[in-house]
Interface confidence: medium
């Protein structure tokens, strides 16, 4: 959880952010309210971009991917690292940076049509049930509009959460990554132990749905840490 | 530009209950963080709890153990379930979302002006 990554401090009281003061209504439209902004850009931040820790792609930046910081280094620290450009080195999509995608191992355009004919594909298209949802992220790739609104059904292949339809999550499967189904009450879920560790999973589960978490099994607490049963249950 | 919209604020006695429900609407397609802020009169503005995209959450000390912070994607809907209330609990409640910015850092979530905000739900907690 962020728990982890964020100290008790970090976000408890907010200070007015770059000598902005509180109780003074900013200006823009949505601002936060009673505080003055200077400059207006609502997606700057305060310090200079210190390692996030990440267990996975989607929890860092559109230009960022999670990965160890040191090669073959311990898959259990992850931090969210600048992404490749062009023709750089890569081992996945979500490395390479926005118009790009991973293609034998070096990060090429996206913009070439026969990418665009792949995932066409392998992604239903379904306009009439166009969720923008809460789990979105914008697609790391340049595709048309037309595009952008389509969602994955089970079994699609995905990049990220938000190529998938509603109730779906994107998870892995051998070495690429499919639309699975969000889990629900009384499924078994996946309990990582350290940041990162669900990096090694071949067969990934989603997240359990809204309103549940992934708890031990109420007759599996007796049981050896090795074997213990986690399961979806309500909060 | 994301609207949000707050619901279920009201009165309640000392170590009651309330679900505060947060609907979204617009380009929630962007949104990476879904944050509740409350303020009291008098106060500074103040983080209560965070939920990102894939579910990891974030709470304020002040109310760790007794607030859930939680989201339904299906329903562009986050929420904020809250047990054990205090008359330090009262205050306007604000649900705010944050964007997917190109580089994240540990201050993204502490920077109010990185958040779109509705118009604030009033929570009352007395005897």
């Known amino acids: 959880t962020l728990n982890s990554v964020l100290n008790s401090n970090a976000i408890k009281n907010l200070p007015p952010p770059l000598g902005g003061a509180a109780g003074h209504p900013g200006s823009a439209v949505s601002a936060a309210p009673g505080i003055l902004y200077p400059g207006g850009n609502k997606y700057q931040t305060i310090d200079n971009y210190q390692p996030y820790p990440c267990a996975e792609d989607e929890e860092c930046g559109t230009d960022e991917y999670c990965a160890s910081p040191t090669r073959g280094g311990d898959a259990g620290v992850q931090i969210c690292l600048a992404c490749r450009k062009r023709r750089k080195r890569c081992m996945r999509h979500a490395m390479c940076c926005p118009g790009n995608y991973c293609k034998n191992g070096i990060c090429v355009s996206s913009d070439q049509n026969h990418f665009r004919g792949e995932i066409e594909e392998t992604i239903t298209e379904s306009f009439g049930n166009d969720h923008s949802t809460l789990d979105g992220y914008s697609r790391r790739t340049t595709l048309s509009s037309k595009m952008y609104h389509t969602k994955g059904q089970e079994g699609s292949v995905c990049l990220r959460s938000s190529d998938c339809a509603s109730g779906l999550c994107c998870a892995r499967h051998f070495w690429s990554k499919i639309c699975k189904p969000v889990l629900k009450e009384g499924q078994v879920c996946t309990k990582h132990r350290r940041k990162g560790s669900h990096g090694l999973e071949i067969f990934q589960r989603c997240y359990c749905g809204e309103g549940l978490s992934c708890r031990i099994q109420k007759d599996h607490h007796q049981a050896s840490n090795s074997s213990r049963l986690h399961t979806c249950q309500r909060h | 530009e994301v609207q949000l919209v707050e619901s279920g604020g009201g009165l309640v006695q000392p170590g009651g209950s309330l679900r505060l429900s947060c609907a979204a609407s617009?380009?929630?397609?962007?949104?990476?963080?879904m944050g509740w802020f409350r303020q009291a009169p008098g106060k500074e503005r103040e983080f209560v709890a965070v939920?990102?995209?894939?579910?990891?959450?974030n709470y304020a000390d002040s109310v760790k153990g007794r607030f859930t912070i939680s989201a339904d994607n299906s329903k562009n809907t986050a929420y904020l379930q809250m047990n054990s209330l205090k008359p330090e609990d009262t205050a306007v409640y604000y649900c705010a979302a944050a964007p997917r910015p190109k580089r994240v850092s540990v201050s993204y979530f502490s920077t109010a002006s990185n958040y779109d905000w509705g118009q604030g739900t009033l929570v009352t907690v007395s005897s």
């Open positions: 617009g380009r929630t397609f962007s949104n990476f963080a």
């Open positions: 939920i990102l995209r894939g579910g990891s959450t």
